[in-house]
């Protein structure tokens, strides 16, 4: 499994280095998750032709993946730090059920899938410490998540492969947008 952020050889070899700031830690965490997603996407794309498929809309109907929009205040135009931070945390919490679905979906990258899931939990904790308005963050309903997970796991093989591809792609996009937004904070 990949080495979590802050534990790579360069960090170990340089104990005199300044400790990471909160923003740097968040940045490093997101990059680490993105690296994991890249590895998972590689396996998905090698295993099937989903990455080139034009039938994504068929599977997308079953999913309600978090997505950034203008109103969320995360884009350069209309940027709003607090609104955006709430959106990022809420979105990550909503992605957790989909990351749970990804477990057992990979053969050679099983550990990588687990690392992405666990690192996302850590990222949420980092961001919650940064947020001033925790009351505005809505946590997904566990019962709804459980039934969604059951529904996704009951899909046929083709739809499961497509769902895996779409989750990875959407999560990557959400994190990239989050990364850009967090650097404006």
């Amino acid at each position: 499994a990949p080495v979590p952020p802050g534990e790579d050889s360069k960090d170990v070899a340089a104990p005199h280095r300044q400790p990471l700031t909160s923003s740097e830690r968040i940045d490093k965490q997101i990059r680490y998750i993105l690296d994991g997603i890249s590895a998972l996407r590689k396996e998905t794309c090698n295993k099937s032709n989903m990455c080139e498929s034009s039938k994504e809309a068929l599977a997308e109907n079953n999913l309600n993946l978090p997505k950034m929009a203008e109103k969320d205040g995360c884009f350069q135009s209309g940027f709003n730090e607090e609104t955006c931070l709430v959106k990022i945390i809420t979105g990550l919490l909503e992605f957790e059920v989909y990351l749970e679905y990804l477990q057992n979906r990979f053969e050679s990258s099983e550990e990588q899938a687990r690392a992405v899931q666990m690192s996302t939990k850590v990222l949420i904790q980092f961001l919650q410490k940064k947020a001033k308005n925790l009351d505005a963050i809505t946590t997904p309903d566990p019962t709804t998540n459980a039934s969604l997970l059951t529904k996704l796991q009951a899909q046929n093989q083709w739809l499961q492969d497509m769902t895996t591809h779409l989750i990875l792609r959407s999560f990557k996009e959400f994190l990239q947008s989050s990364l850009r937004a967090l650097r404006q904070m």
């Epitope: 940045d27 990059r31 890249s38 950034m68 929009a69 884009f75 350069q76 990239q176 947008s177 404006q184």
Partner: antibody, heavy 120, light 107 residues
């Protein structure tokens, strides 16, 4: 093959407007991050603007913010750079390019560039 | 804004030489650095990204290293087609910024 064909450059007076076009082939702009970079005569490269396919959000350099607008026409697989209130310092070669599909943001495909000259 | 400073501005070398160009960022950018090659009248071409990953199709004589604020581009054995201007670019935060360029010329 993957390529970007640019058009729309030329000589324009200060305060004038110009629209640059960038037609993509070999890939779809609706699932790629696009970027405009410019180069003043004899100078280095300067980032101008980004267009992210994800939700279509745009980013601009401070030097062009409020004057330049990037947009796209997915049906034509084309990206545009609308340049208003042009100044002499906007003179240069404008490159349309594509960010690679990874999170380390390097530019892997470049157009050949189009020259914009702002002069009276 | 992150300022990228390249050195030297001009470098004279001969075919077969090993050359190194350095790029320094005004603040830490981790490995978010790319190198480009540009020949007169042409668009730039990506050589390296993520500080040390070679772009596909780029000859292995090109290599990149560094992390944080200090980066290097090395050409192990100069070929005639390598005489050009080289730029580094940070993609740590917007505005994305480029170094001022290093012109590699024939000695």
């Amino acid at each position: 093959q993957v390529q970007l064909v640019q058009s729309g450059g030329g000589l324009i007076q200060p305060g004038g407007s110009l629209r640059l076009s960038c037609a993509a082939s070999g890939f779809t702009i609706s699932s790629n991050y696009m970027v405009w970079v410019r180069q003043a005569p004899g100078k280095g490269l300067e980032w101008v603007s980004d267009l992210y396919y994800y939700a279509g959000d745009t980013y601009y350099a401070d030097s062009v913010k409020g004057r330049f607008t990037v947009s796209r026409d997915i049906s034509k697989n084309t990206v545009y750079l609308q340049m208003n209130s042009l100044r002499a310092e906007d003179t240069g070669v404008y490159y349309c390019a594509r960010w690679a599909d990874d999170h380390y943001y390097h530019i892997d495909v470049w157009g050949r560039g189009t020259l914009v000259t702002v002069s009276s | 804004d992150i300022v990228m400073t390249q050195s030297p501005s001009t470098l004279s070398a001969s075919v077969g030489d090993r050359v190194t160009i350095t790029c320094r960022a005004s603040q830490g950018i981790s490995s978010w650095l790319a190198w480009y090659q540009q020949k007169p009248g042409r668009a730039p071409k990506a050589l390296i990204y993520k500080a040390s990953t070679l772009e596909s199709g780029v000859p292995s004589r090109f290599s990149g290293s560094g992390s944080g604020t200090d980066f290097t581009l090395t050409i192990s054995s100069l070929q005639p087609e390598d005489f050009a201007t080289y730029y580094c670019q940070q993609s740590y935060s917007t505005p994305w910024t480029f170094g001022q360029g290093t012109k590699l010329e024939i000695k």
